[in-house]
Structures are given as structure tokens and as C-alpha cells.
């Protein structure tokens, strides 16, 4: 499965159409900084057959686009950026599962690691919870926006490690 | 490699506007915050503002408001600072200095080597 | 604006001694405090982020502790290349603002 070649490439459009999101500068929301706990260690790649980093980042994806598909989330941001958003992570939820249809037999090893998929929902659950008690400011918005540009941009070396397993 | 590289020293009039750049190399440069800080002889740190290219706008230090202008130029990855009605005390080293990629600006990781902008008469 | 007080404003030290500077917020500042190193003619260079993190590249031996108000960066084992000025920043709101700095000199 040839993942990290058509995968970075939209990882980056998507960084880039994220940076684009912006509506106020992280400048004026310095102290609504919150440490969501994003789970670095589910993304290092180091324990993980191919498939169950696949699993990982198919996950990942998944969380974000749910994330960012809530009515909140449609209120505050450029509709028309949010589609392209949508496009991407649509397109890269399409190839992760099309790798993990080829990775089926490949491995012996189970296609999901269970306890990997749990933290990275409970990552998310921690970033709803923040929204929802800071009642969807914008500058809450701007934290969330930040930090999922800062896991994507991480997860984008979970994808290296994999090209690299080729 | 990250490199932040300014342009050279300048001597002012009293009254009169310096634009000092810093050209960027390493990174994606719309998407990490580029602050200005300056030093005057002797003296220590101040924070003048900082601008995320990709939003365009910057952040001023109540300080400077009105008299800086903070910009940048996403083709040629250069950032600028202009600073108007300079008097004598204006005379400072100014930094530029990069936030980490996808952060909040919140720390100084990378500095340009300086740039010294004297106000005299 | 949030003030920072730093004390010593300078101190001189010997290669080998154990230094610590302190760091004082006018507010609360959370964790949200950074540390710099700047040596004559040079630009400053980040040692301790967060209150307590070591940057990536910087030695051991310097260290970062507090919340709050207070803060201190330690030396634990005083090396010839340290002699320079160290400075402290708050980052918890804009404007971000520094102390006045410490010299740290030799003895």
C-alpha cells in the first residue's frame, strides 16, 4: 500500500487550509491555551504493526471531521473552507481504509489496536469538553483549531515512519 | 535549518520612519508567528508585536500602537517592522523572532541576528 | 501589563558553584513562563520553556521550577560558557513581557 505518498500530500493541503480557518489571532487567546494531552505516544510509531498505525490515523481523521461537522463548528467557520476541510480528510479517510483493505492477511497482528483507538477518542472527548465549558467562544475555537494543526502535523511523522516500512 | 536573517543598520533623523526586514527560511512561513522584540543599549528586552501571516493582521504592544507597523509578504517569506516618529530613545537593537510552526506564539525559539537602528540628530 | 522582577539584577559566580535566579510575575502567570540566555552582541537563545521544560539542544545543568508568581532557573554546576545575562518572559497574555535580566558575572 503506497499511503504516504498521496496521504502527506493532502496532510499538507489540509495544515494549509487549517492555517487558512483562522478568524482571530492566537495572539489575542493566549490565556485560553489548555493542554489537551494528545497522546504522542500513539503516534510514534515504534510498537505498532502497519495496520494498527492505520487504524490510528484513520481515527485521528475520523475525530477531526466529526469535530469540525457539528452545527458549532459550522457557525464559526468559512463555509467554503470547511468544505475543501471535508474534501481532504474525506479523501484521506478513503485511502486509509483502501490501505487497510490491502493490509487484511498481510499481518498476523489484530488490524486495530483497541487501547490506541480509545485514547485518541478520549484525546477528543477532553477537546469537546473544553469547547462546550468555554461555550464555543471564539477563542476556544482558535485553541482547538491550533492544537489539531499541531496533531496533524505530528501524526505526520507516524506517516514517515510508515513510508519508510515500505 | 531555520534562518531569520535582517537587513542592516540604520541611522535616523528625529521624526522620521526605519522599516527593518527579516527574511525567513525553514518552515512553512504563513503558518508560525514572527514577533518583533527590541533592546536598547544597555538595557533589556520589550516586546514591539507579532503577526501569523496567514491572518494578516498583526498584534501591537499597547506601547507601540500607532507607530509600528508590523507586515508580511508571503512570496519572498520576509517579515517587516516599521517604526514612525522616531525620537532618540527609539535608538535599540530590533530582534525579529519566530514562534514554533502550529503553536501559539507564546515562546521565542528561533532570533534574527539584529538589527541596530540609531536616532539622531 | 504583567510586570516581571527579576532578583538578582546581578551576581557574580565561580566555574563549578550552583547559581539560581528568581523570577517574579505581578499576577498569576500559570506555568506560562520562559527563560532566556543572551550573551554580548548576540541574540537571546531560549533555555526553559513552560516554567520547567529544557529546549531541545540545551544542557542539563539548567533547570526551570514554579507557577504561579514565583520562578527560578537554577545552574546546577556553573560552566565557563554561561557567564552571559539571562532574562525571564511571561507568555500568558499579550503584551508578552520580560524581566529586566540577570548578569551573571565571573567572581
Known amino acids: 500500500c503506497d499511503l504516504p505518498q498521496t496521504h502527506s500530500l493532502s496532510n499538507r493541503r489540509t495544515l494549509m487550509i487549517m492555517a487558512q480557518m483562522g478568524r482571530i489571532s492566537p495572539f489575542s487567546c493566549l490565556k485560553d491555551r489548555h493542554d489537551f494531552g494528545f497522546p504522542q505516544e500513539e503516534f510514534d510509531g515504534n510498537q505498532f504493526q502497519k495496520a494498527q498505525a492505520i487504524s490510528v490515523l484513520h481515527e485521528m481523521i475520523q475525530q477531526t471531521f466529526n469535530l469540525f461537522s457539528t452545527k458549532d463548528s459550522s457557525a464559526t467557520w468559512d463555509e467554503t473552507l470547511l468544505d475543501k476541510f471535508y474534501t481532504e480528510l474525506y479523501q484521506q479517510l478513503n485511502d486509509l481504509e483502501a490501505c487497510m483493505m490491502q493490509e487484511v492477511g498481510v499481518e498476523d497482528t489484530p488490524l486495530m489496536n483497541v487501547d490506541s483507538i480509545l485514547t485518541v477518542r478520549k484525546y477528543f472527548q477532553r477537546i469537546t469538553l473544553y469547547l462546550t465549558e468555554k461555550k464555543y467562544s471564539p477563542c476556544a475555537w482558535e485553541v482547538v483549531r491550533a492544537e489539531i494543526m499541531r496533531s496533524f502535523s505530528l501524526s505526520a511523522n507516524l506517516q514517515e515512519r510508515l513510508r519508510r516500512k515500505e | 535549518q531555520v534562518q531569520l536573517v535582517q537587513s542592516g543598520a540604520e541611522v535616523k533623523k528625529p521624526g522620521s520612519s526605519v522599516k527593518v526586514s527579516c527574511k525567513a527560511s525553514g518552515g512553512t512561513f504563513s503558518s508560525y508567528a514572527i514577533s518583533w522584540v527590541r533592546q536598547a543599549p544597555g538595557q533589556g528586552l520589550e516586546w514591539m508585536g507579532g503577526?501569523?501571516?496567514?491572518?494578516?493582521?498583526?498584534n501591537y504592544a499597547q506601547k507601540f500602537q500607532g507607530r509600528v507597523t508590523i507586515t508580511a509578504d508571503e512570496s519572498t517569506s520576509t517579515a517587516y517592522m516599521e517604526l514612525s516618529s522616531l525620537r532618540s530613545e527609539d535608538t535599540a537593537v530590533y530582534y525579529c523572532?519566530?514562534?514554533?510552526?502550529?503553536?501559539?506564539?507564546?515562546?521565542?525559539?528561533?532570533w534574527g541576528q539584529g538589527t541596530l537602528v540609531t536616532v539622531s540628530s | 501589563d504583567i510586570q516581571m522582577t527579576q532578583s538578582p539584577s546581578s551576581l557574580s559566580a565561580s566555574v563549578g558553584d550552583r547559581v539560581t535566579i528568581t523570577c517574579r510575575a505581578s499576577q498569576s502567570i500559570s506555568s506560562y513562563l520562559n527563560w532566556y540566555q543572551q550573551k554580548p552582541g548576540k541574540a537571546p537563545k531560549l533555555l526553559i520553556y513552560f516554567a520547567s521544560s529544557l529546549q531541545s539542544g540545551v544542557p542539563s545543568r539548567f533547570s526551570g521550577s514554579g507557577s504561579g508568581t514565583d520562578f527560578t532557573l537554577t545552574i546546577s554546576s556553573l560552566q565557563p560558557e554561561d557567564f552571559a545575562t539571562y532574562y525571564c518572559q511571561q507568555s500568558y497574555s499579550t503584551p508578552l513581557t520580560f524581566g529586566q535580566g540577570t548578569k551573571v558575572e565571573i567572581k
Open positions: 523572532a519566530r514562534h514554533l510552526e502550529y503553536a501559539f506564539p507564546d515562546k521565542f525559539d528561533y
Open positions: 503577526i501569523i501571516p496567514i491572518f494578516g493582521t498583526a
